[in-house]
């Protein structure tokens, strides 16, 4: 058993049929010694008396808010949550496995640049009685500070028969060093509580591996005289790290016909312009990637050919 | 070339070769099935590699003030990785494929380190840790880790030389 926050405790249980459970001793936070009784949740049934209460926690029915009273007055509360461990594997019932980029991916994170700011998000099908708390650091043995905001509901989607809820959080490394080569990963820890179930989820990554630039901006076409060719030009996204001579991007330019089946013409360039043939009803798209490290490509920025 | 008086390197040549190194490092080790190497207990293996850290002067401002600190750090790293790629970690079993980019990568690391430091002048180099994995699967894992680490290192080096070529070239 360990304290999650004031008066909230997590009981770690080996979870299998007929498991013996854990013996927990609760102590009433009071100088009083006599006449103390204990109840669970809204029930008025007295579970025991005395300054301490010993319980065998096996099931969710044994968890909840234990309250000690004296003469009708509440003295203190202890909320017990359960953390299930099946065969050495902690339960992951609250969040959905996003399966990208690999199985057992519950948290996904992205950064638009090397400033030390990043966003993480996760999915759940649970709509009520749900709270999240997020902590982060650079490294784990001698952690350096990363400040995270509160997790917020960022999207709702209907998937088949049930609704899916996306939560996200923004974090910022306190003393980021954009030009350095990271040697210690960022650690993100999410505590999730649904009713009386506690779970924790972690992700470990280097900012360089979660970089996904915003799409190029100001995408423009300039027809070339007496030719089917056009000059496409664009600019670095505003959110990308500066100076661009240091934090350089590379670009992919694609000409795509109306039909998805039509052959795509692709050009790769380090410049912010390219000359391509513009077919009727086609569109031109450009996306960006870090020039020197193969993290994610940005989404496409597109303009029609006409 | 960076010579004992601290004159400028051939920024453009270094830029071209470092960009080639980035390409080679990624072709030598694309993201193999998303193997999460941090889960594989890498403390004793890749913690000893030289990293380009915050105080090494490799940021744009530091390069403008005095690029020598940064270039020395990059040189140390190049020599370190060149030795690792020439060690039995890469020469032992399982054998690399004949057309593996590791050979080219090895040669390019040497080439860039020589561009930075001509014969007759010596910056101190970092000691190679003695890594002698016993099992072929351990050696394979170590190769992946080294190449992943090298990708990060050469990316920073390439940024340094690109910025130098654009802003510090005579």
């Amino acid at each position: 058993i360990w304290e999650l926050k004031k008066d909230v405790y997590v009981v770690e249980l080996d979870w299998y049929p007929d498991a013996p459970g854990e013996m927990v001793v609760l102590t009433c936070d009071t100088p009083e010694e006599d006449g103390i009784t204990w109840t669970l949740d809204q029930s008025s049934e007295v579970l025991g008396s005395g300054k301490t209460l010993t319980i065998q926690v096996k099931e969710f029915g044994d968890a909840g808010q234990y309250t000690c009273h004296k003469g009708g007055e509440v003295l203190s509360h202890s909320l017990l949550l359960l953390h299930k461990k099946e065969d050495g594997i902690w339960s992951t019932d609250i969040l959905k496995d996003q399966k990208e980029p690999k199985n057992k991916t519950f948290l996904r994170c992205e950064a638009k640049n090397y400033s030390g700011r990043f966003t993480c998000w996760w999915l759940t099908t649970i709509s009520t009685d749900l709270t999240f708390s997020v902590k982060s650091s650079r490294g784990s043995s001698d952690p350096q500070g990363v400040t995270c905001g509160a997790a917020t509901l960022s999207a709702e989607r209907v998937r088949g028969d049930n609704k899916e809820y996306e939560y996200s959080v923004e974090c910022q490394e306190d003393s980021a060093c954009p030009a350095a080569e990271e040697s210690l990963p960022i650690e993100v820890m999410v505590d999730a509580v649904h009713k009386l179930k506690y779970e924790n989820y972690t992700s470990s990554f280097f900012i360089r591996d979660i970089i996904k630039p915003d799409p190029p901006k100001n995408l423009q076409l300039k027809p070339l005289k007496n030719s089917r060719q056009v000059e496409v030009s664009w600019e670095y996204p505003d959110t990308w790290s500066t100076p661009h001579s240091y934090f350089s991007l590379t670009f992919c330019v694609q000409v795509q016909g109306k039909s998805k089946r039509e052959k795509k013409d692709r050009v790769f360039t380090d410049k912010t312009s390219a000359t391509v043939i513009c077919r009727k009803n086609a569109s031109i798209s450009v996306r960006a990637q870090d020039r020197y490290y193969s993290s994610s490509w940005s989404e496409w920025a597109s303009v029609p050919c006409s | 070339r960076a010579v004992p008086g601290g004159s400028s390197p051939a920024w453009t040549q270094c830029q071209q070769l470092s960009q080639k190194l980035c390409t080679l490092a990624w072709s030598a080790h694309p993201l193999v099935g998303h193997m999460d190497l941090r889960e594989e207990g890498d403390e004793e293996t890749t913690n000893d590699v030289p990293h380009i850290q915050c105080g090494d002067g490799c940021d744009p401002q530091g390069l403008r003030d005095n690029s020598q600190f940064c270039l020395q750090r990059i040189h140390q790293g190049l020599i370190f990785y060149e030795k690792l790629l020439g060690s039995d970690i890469f020469t032992g079993e399982p054998s690399l494929l004949p057309d593996s980019p590791v050979g080219q990568l090895h040669a390019s690391l040497l080439g860039l380190s020589q561009l930075l430091q001509p014969e007759g002048h010596h910056w101190e180099t970092q000691q190679i840790p003695s890594l002698s994995p016993s099992q072929p699967w351990q050696r394979l894992l170590l190769r992946f880790k080294i190449l992943r680490s090298l990708q990060a290192f050469v990316a920073v080096a390439a940024r340094v030389f690109a910025h130098g070529a654009a802003t510090l070239s005579p």
């Epitope: 299998y16 099931e59 065969d87 050495g88 496995d97 | 207990g41 699967w137």
Partner: antibody
Framework: EVQLLESGGGLVQPGGSLRLSCAAS????????MGWVRQAPGKGLEWVSY????????GYADSVKGRFTISRDNSKNTLYLQMNSLRAEDTAVYYC?????????WGQGTLVTVSS | DIQMTQSPGTLSLSPGERATLSCRAS???????LAWYQQKPGQAPRLLIY???SRATGIPDRFSGSGSGTDFTLTISRLEPEDFAVYYC?????????FGQGTKVEIK
């Protein structure tokens, strides 16, 4: 007392399908992960598949991926294994077991024979 | 996948003797996630040990497990007549979970 009772085994032709069931009693079925383990005649054990308590997380052995589907009906206290595109090498006794990775409690097994 | 190799294939011993069964993994088994099972002819297997050394409910203390990394051992301190069976080890530290081929403990 934990009890697991498999059913649905039998003789099936290669390429055919079969659905195994496992009726659970003596414990709160909906709260625990479950799995299927098989044993070819005279051979060792192979973990086939597992499913979390809610059914949200599943896992399969490479040898059955894409052909077998594990599911559960918590209201009926029953675990299922839908086996499609059966092959001769799927011939085995199929055991239902509690647990996501460690089989603490086992059923008595049901024999699946794939033969033409 | 992690391959599990058990040795010996067969162990011929007399009741009252000590049995030592070995299980070796092709790669390190994380967090000592290793289990041992006993199977008698015509019966389902029975869990003996999990987490390399923790005895399952109702398992007599003559059964003990030890080891970590790639080498694990099941020891039966004094063989009882009912202990003659096939024993399997299983790793569950890395998916897919894999079993050893088994060690048969037979009466000498």
């Amino acid at each position: 007392e934990v009890q697991l009772l498999e059913s649905g085994g039998g003789l099936v032709q290669p390429g055919g399908s079969l659905r195994l069931s496992c009726a659970a009693s003596g414990f709160t079925f909906s709260r625990y992960s479950m799995g299927w383990v098989r044993q070819a005649p005279g051979k060792g054990l192979e973990w086939v598949s597992y499913i979390s308590s809610s059914g949200g997380v599943t896992g399969y052995a490479d040898s059955v991926k894409g052909r077998f589907t594990i599911s559960r009906d918590n209201s009926k206290n029953t675990l299922y294994l839908q086996m499609n595109s059966l092959r001769a090498e799927d011939t085995a006794v199929y055991y239902c077991a509690t647990g996501i990775a460690v089989a603490r409690y086992w059923g008595q097994g049901t024999l699946v024979t794939v033969s033409s | 996948d992690i391959q599990m190799t058990q040795s010996p294939g067969t162990l011929s011993l007399s009741p009252g003797e000590r049995a030592t069964l070995s299980c070796r993994a092709s790669q390190s088994v994380s967090s000592s996630y290793l289990a041992w099972y006993q199977q008698k002819p015509g019966q389902a297997p029975r869990l003996l040990i999990y987490g390399a050394s923790s005895r399952a409910t109702g398992i007599p203390d003559r059964f003990s497990g030890s080891g970590s990394g790639t080498d694990f051992t099941l020891t039966i301190s004094r063989l009882e007549p009912e202990d003659f069976a096939v024993y399997y080890c299983q790793q569950y530290g890395s998916s897919p979970w894999t079993f050893g081929q088994g060690t048969k403990v037979e009466i000498k």
